[in-house]
């Protein structure tokens, strides 16, 4: 008789999760010489230790600290790109602008990107059937707490001018409930960060509105200003051209507004 197991509302652990994490770790450490010292088996052990045998609605930041310790990485603090609801373009950008980094360009972000995982209380099993959904089940689930933890540390490390890419096609361009709005904004350190510069990415070809005047952007400006950090905003009207000009800045068409 199969043992009863908790049914959660979200998808289960990504298939071959342990193998995927281990393989990504090995690949990352091969590509990034500064992380060659990392012992990927130890990283996986610490990752596993954060959620295995624990109730998947009772995970804390403390549980992930051993993994944070092993994955400690120094990225240039003035080259950080945050993003909200526009991950693909942000990643395309840092793939071209190699001296800038999103969270997913760091080891820990790279390991977990697009993966789901959870365990079960008091068993060493990984739950491949279902995992808690943030809204329908609980917020203190393994995936949400992981991203909250790494995002907080990433934002805390930032300095000078920090950039954030925002999706101008969404009803809330700045969403207080996103990871950027609820975690990263509040963990930028005013004594280190001079300016937050928002890049609002337009979706429509003919969209010439100044989305920097959007009420949610004004709300972001207010939050940031109250934290004694300067705020600036730029419209990126043509994201395709924007990427092209990052690749080829000397192109004659790149002098005009993008």
């Amino acid at each position: 008789v199969p043992r009863w197991r908790q049914q959660w509302s979200g998808p289960g652990t990504t298939k071959r999760f342990p193998e995927t994490v281990l393989a990504r770790c090995v690949k990352y450490t091969e590509i990034h010489p500064e992380m060659r010292h990392v012992d990927c088996q130890s990283v996986w052990d610490a990752f596993k230790g954060a959620f295995i045998s624990k109730h998947p609605c009772n995970i804390t930041e403390e549980d992930y600290q051993p993994l944070m310790k092993l994955g400690t990485q120094t990225v240039p603090c003035n080259k950080i790109l945050l993003w909200s609801r526009i991950k693909d373009l942000a990643h395309q950008f840092t793939q071209v602008q190699r001296d800038m980094f999103t969270l997913e360009d760091t080891l820990l972000g790279y390991l977990a990107d697009d993966l789901t995982w959870c365990g079960e209380f008091n068993t060493s099993k990984i739950n491949y059937q279902s995992c808690p959904d943030w809204r329908k089940d609980c917020s203190n689930n393994p995936v949400s707490v992981f991203w909250k933890t790494v995002s907080r540390r990433f934002a805390e490390a930032a300095c000078d001018v920090v950039h954030v890419m925002l999706n101008g096609s969404r009803s809330k361009i700045f969403d207080k409930n996103s990871t950027f709005g609820s975690v990263e904004v509040h963990n930028l350190q005013p004594e280190k960060v001079q300016t937050l510069e928002a890049w609002v990415i337009h979706g429509g070809r003919e969209d010439s509105r100044d989305l920097c005047q959007d009420p949610t952007i004004k709300e972001l400006e207010s939050i940031i200003s109250k934290r004694n950090i300067q705020f600036s905003c730029k419209n990126i009207y043509r994201p395709d051209k924007f990427l092209q000009c990052v690749k080829n800045p000397e192109d004659s068409s790149c002098t005009s507004e993008i």
């Epitope: 010292h37 012992d39 088996q41 130890s42 052990d45 610490a46 230790g49 930041e61 403390e62 600290q65 051993p66 944070m68 310790k69 092993l70 400690t72 933890t149 907080r152």
Partner: antibody
């Protein structure tokens, strides 16, 4: 019985070296992070160094970085602390301790070994 | 200079309840553990993972954590509880750090 037993403490001159050992028994040594913690006479506890279960990662307090080296031999169930360029302020009782599940706490402690740095 | 702050001393009479506190910013996101060091002996783990007791530790010892502070409570104080008590956690660099210690005197 779970046990840690330190040895190697001695009187040594400033600038000298010393190697402390800590033998472990009663638990699977190779599964656990281990730490060295010291206590100067009449003072509180001070964390010195950590080593991961497989020995591939080490961490040090700023006060000993570059002078002390933590290592382990899992086949011999032994933890080491190599202490070089010793200073008077390194005088202390040195304890080895087993870490419970990385960061839960230090659940097993040795009895300590005394290091005195003096001319 | 420890990033975990403890009062240097505390006292109580037999049977009383005493509380020892520990504060520091790193407590917020890291587990806190508590240690008892009887005179002339090695430290002993009293509390791990913020509030859990290892087997063998009497339930007179309890602990809690809230925000950037943690506390250890000892109820039904006994003369044998006279000792130094240390809190510990990981710091912002994810290395162990101990509080300065609190000397508990049973009057």
């Amino acid at each position: 019985e779970v046990q840690l037993l330190e040895s190697g403490g001695d009187l040594v001159q400033p600038g000298g070296s010393l190697r402390l050992s800590c033998g472990a028994s009663g638990f699977t040594f190779s599964d656990h992070y281990m730490s060295w913690v010291r206590q100067a006479p009449g003072k509180g506890l001070e964390w010195v160094a950590d080593i991961s279960a497989r020995g591939s990662n080490t961490w040090y307090a700023d006060s000993v970085k570059g002078r002390f080296t933590i290592s382990r031999d899992n086949s011999e169930n032994t933890l080491y602390l190599q202490m070089n360029s010793l200073r008077a302020e390194d005088t202390a009782v040195y304890y080895c301790a087993k870490n419970w599940n990385y960061n839960y706490g230090m659940d097993v402690w040795g009895q300590g070994t005394t290091v005195t740095v003096s001319s | 200079q420890s990033v975990l702050t403890q009062a240097p001393s505390a006292s109580g009479t037999p049977g009383q309840r005493v509380t020892i506190s520990c504060s520091g910013s790193s407590i917020q996101n890291n587990y806190v553990s508590w240690y008892q060091q009887l005179p002339g002996t090695a430290p002993k783990l009293l509390i791990y993972r913020n509030f859990e007791r290892p087997s063998g530790v009497p339930d007179r010892f309890s602990a809690s954590k809230s925000g950037t502070s943690a506390s250890l409570a000892i109820s039904g104080l006994q003369s044998g509880d006279e000792a130094d008590y240390y809190c510990a956690s990981w710091d912002d660099s994810l290395n162990w750090v101990f509080g300065g210690g609190t000397k508990l005197t049973v009057l």
